[in-house]
Interface confidence: medium
Amino acid sequence: IQIPEEYEGHHVMEPPVITEQSPRRLVVFPTDDISLKCEASGKPEVQFRWTRDGVHFKPKEELGVTVYQSPHSGSFTITGNNSNFAQRFQGIYRCFASNKLGTAMSHEIRLMAEGAPKWPKETVKPVEVEEGESVVLPCNPPPSAEPLRIYWMNSKILHIKQDERVTMGQNGNLYFANVLTSDNHSDYICHAHFPGTRTIIQKEPIDLRVKATNSMIDRKPRLLFPTNSSSHLVALQGQPLVLECIAEGFPTPTIKWLRPSGPMPADRVTYQNHNKTLQLLKVGEEDDGEYRCLAENSLGSARHAYYVTVEAA
């Protein structure tokens, strides 16, 4: 039997399948448009509808905004034609694609409106410290739903050189294991880069004043981060795990990492930031257990134990 080409598949029906959707978390900034994506396949052709916070949401019926809705698609863009509009559309969205055979549902898409990030206005007092002592210059970037990159510079836009003695922590603070008179500068500036808003903001400059001494006193290591002797944390399977230890002391301490509960997974471990950071790529069940950092100098040592519990993502 020969079936004409134009007839082939004509009566083949397919239930809806979501083929493309927005990420689960979507951050919108004041000058941005809002684009929510939902594409689906199915025969007969699928019909789309959206809910926001569980209530039927019709983009085209929203007042005071311009909406572009793609034909044969659930995707739409709301044009931000005023400075308040993103606030109005915060919420949890869901797309439903339906035909005679059923309905497919997207995951929940949490739309968050954020202001362009700003540092709180503050007066930064000079930091005074004796040569050889340790010091921490705080960054404390403003909270943000999106990831940010932090770096320290001086007023000439030159990066502050980091080494075993001077380190920026994961939290953005700048740690000095011991200060030298050459660290005496009035313009330590923490910059935060928010890729989502294409924004770079900078903290007020910190004036670090180092008082010279005739004899620097040797000090055994002490951990500046973490400050306690042990901590428990949960790592998700398949995700990276980052552990950090930053120490002070004179001479500058060195950091070693040990795993008392078994061998270090050498093929998946990298050490960064002059050994102060241990990064484990793609955590597995076998990575459960204790990880220990050891800070050592000629006068002694300090340690921190991380107890890691691996859970399914």
């Epitope: 900034f29 004041p30 000058t31 005023n82 400075s83 308040n84 700003k118 294409r198 903001i201």
Partner: antibody, heavy 118, light 113 residues
Framework: QVQLVQSGSELKKPGASVKLSCKAS????????MQWVRQAPGQGLEWIGE????????NYNEMFKSRAVLSVDTSVSTAYMQLCSLKAEDTAVYYC???????????WGQGTLVTVSS | DIVMTQSPSSLAVSVGERVTMSCKSS????????????LAWYQQKPGQSPKLLIY???TRESGVPDRFSGSGSGTDFTLTISSVKAEDVALYYC?????????FGQGTKLEIK
């Protein structure tokens, strides 16, 4: 730190036009809406309009829609407000201010005094 | 347009006294999507630009002394100065940024006896 520096005082005759500038620094110019607000002598604050520097989109108070034009030059991080067909009642201090759709107008320029007198 | 009405138009108090001023809007300033009231309070000292004190009706702007507080929801709002200082002499404006055009109250003038 964020700074908005406005152009100097202007003395204009009725019927003339004036173009005020607001030079921004210390933040990413295209990430915030720029607002314009005026204050007549001894009077309260009046919102004129706003502009999105990233795409030039504007919103105006209906009272000013026919006479005010907001614009930006992103290459020099500067916002402008032009007001035409000036009347004596337009004598006021004109402020630019930042608003990011979130925290209200939290940074203001120092203001520009426009005097309209024959 | 949303009309903002402030009262009193002026008040004179002694240093150390508690002071409250009111702001009423002709429509609700509460957004249901985020449960925030889009109302701000500004302080304007003679010859200066306005300065933001409070946003979202009750959130104090960073660097603003904690003697300033905002309260209220919907259409009725209050700015309170718990213990007035001589430097608080100024005009205080409320402003709605819920709907266009943004509108300000006519202001409350605070003076020291």
């Amino acid at each position: 730190q964020v700074q908005l520096v406005q152009s100097g005082s202007e003395l204009k005759k009725p019927g003339a036009s004036v173009k005020l500038s607001c030079k921004a620094s210390g933040y990413t110019f295209t990430s915030y809406w720029m607002q314009w607000v005026r204050q007549a002598p001894g009077q309260g604050l009046e919102w004129i309009g706003e502009i999105n520097p990233s795409n030039g989109r504007t919103n105006y108070n209906e009272m000013f829609k026919s006479r005010a034009v907001l614009s930006v030059d992103t290459s020099v991080s500067t916002a402008y407000m032009q007001l035409c067909s000036l009347k004596a009642e337009d004598t006021a201090v004109y402020y630019c201010a930042l608003y990011d759709g979130y925290y209200a107008m939290d940074y203001w320029g120092q203001g520009t005094l426009v005097t309209v007198s024959s | 347009d949303i009309v903002m009405t402030q009262s009193p138009s002026s008040l004179a108090v002694s240093v150390g006294e508690r002071v409250t001023m009111s702001c009423k809007s002709s429509q609700s300033l509460l957004y249901s999507s985020n449960q925030k009231n889009y109302l701000a309070w500004y302080q304007q000292k003679p010859g200066q630009s306005p300065k933001l004190l409070i946003y979202w009706a009750s959130t104090r702007e960073s660097g603003v002394p904690d003697r300033f507080s905002g309260s209220g929801s919907g259409t009725d709002f209050t700015l309170t100065i718990s213990s007035v200082k001589a430097e608080d002499v100024a005009l205080y404006y409320c402003q709605q940024y819920h709907s266009y055009p943004f509108t300000f109250g006519q202001g409350t003038k605070l003076e020291i006896k």
